[in-house]
């Protein structure tokens, strides 16, 4: 499942970047865009047992995800 | 989500290589869909992409030459890149990082283009 | 343009031996607190792989005797052992901003 809000804050950005919810931070363009616009991961179907494509994107330890989801662990996830 | 590059294999000097790039389990108007090439023996060189909302970067090492497009009813792009020189003989990849860290975590196979007459 | 460098050019190590891969940037691949340094496995006539992504994730389906390591322009790709399949042409890719740039690469062969 696809967290809500996020929006990205560091030394680079003069100012907190919110995102409200559904919304992704797109670093590209460098402001809020739909997360339905941004290649974000997809849960997996409760029960799917064929494996992943080759070279999906998979959380680990030090990224706070969700099943199936990779986050931002950012200092300005809000 | 499969990408699968076409297009010619052999262009002329001052021609035009054109190629496209058919994506399939998902939708172009959502994510980044760039191009790639690799020198033979080479390493890998960024061309650029086109984004969700048709926008486009082309590095600046080839921005004079480059277009990318695309056709979002046959969920395809293209990369067009004029003026060739045997210097742009090189394998062709298409590739789409994932949000949010922008990582080519989905390639094409690769189509090789040679360059000469 | 962020500059890459991947050293050694070539490591000549025996399979069941430890592999260290460097890449060095030319300015700091981090922002928002995250280092965006990828690493992938490249086979003669294949496309590249995703085996590691911000730095230290390993992508799917990605062993566990891959591991990634680093911060700032300072990276490392590290094989805790060798396996007869890893020999190949590893490259460092940053995703910080574009254009999007490669190391060169490091051959990894059989001694």
């Known amino acids: 499942m696809r967290r809500g809000p996020r929006s990205l804050r560091g030394r680079d950005a003069p100012a907190p970047t919110p995102c409200v919810p559904a919304e992704c931070f797109d670093l590209l363009v460098r402001h809020c865009v739909a997360c339905g616009l941004l290649r974000t991961p997809r849960p997996k179907p409760a029960g799917a047992s064929s494996p992943a494509p080759r070279t999906a994107l998979q959380p680990q330890e030090s990224v706070g995800a969700g099943a199936g989801e990779a986050a931002l662990p950012l200092p300005g996830l809000l | 989500v499969q990408l699968q590059e076409s297009g010619p294999g052999l262009v002329k000097p001052s021609q035009t290589l054109s190629l496209t790039c058919t994506v399939s389990g998902d939708s172009i108007t959502s994510g980044y869909w760039n191009w790639i090439r690799q020198h033979p023996g080479k390493g890998l060189e960024y061309i650029g992409y086109i984004s969700y909302s048709g926008s486009t970067y082309y590095n600046p090492s080839l921005k004079s030459r480059v277009t990318i497009s695309r056709d979002t009813s046959k969920n395809q792009y293209s990369l067009k890149l004029s003026s060739v020189t045997a210097a742009d003989t090189a394998v062709y990849y298409c590739a789409s990082p994932n949000y949010p860290f922008y990582a080519m975590d989905y390639w094409g196979q690769g189509t090789l283009v040679t360059v000469s007459s | 343009d962020i500059v890459l460098t991947q050293s050694p050019a070539t490591l000549s190590l025996s399979p069941g031996e430890r592999a260290t891969l460097s890449c060095r940037a030319s300015e700091s691949v981090d922002n928002y607190g995250i280092s965006f340094m990828n690493w992938f496995q490249q086979k003669p006539g294949q496309a590249p792989r995703l085996l590691i992504y911000?730095?230290?994730n390993r992508a799917t389906g990605i062993p566990a005797r891959f591991s990634g390591s680093g911060s700032g322009t300072d990276f490392t790709l590290t094989i805790s052992s060798l396996e007869p399949e890893d020999f190949a042409v590893y490259y460092c890719?940053?995703?910080?901003?574009?254009?999007?740039?490669f190391g060169g690469g490091t051959k990894v062969e059989i001694k």
């Open positions: 890719q940053q995703s910080k901003e574009v254009p999007w740039t």
């Open positions: 911000a730095a230290s």
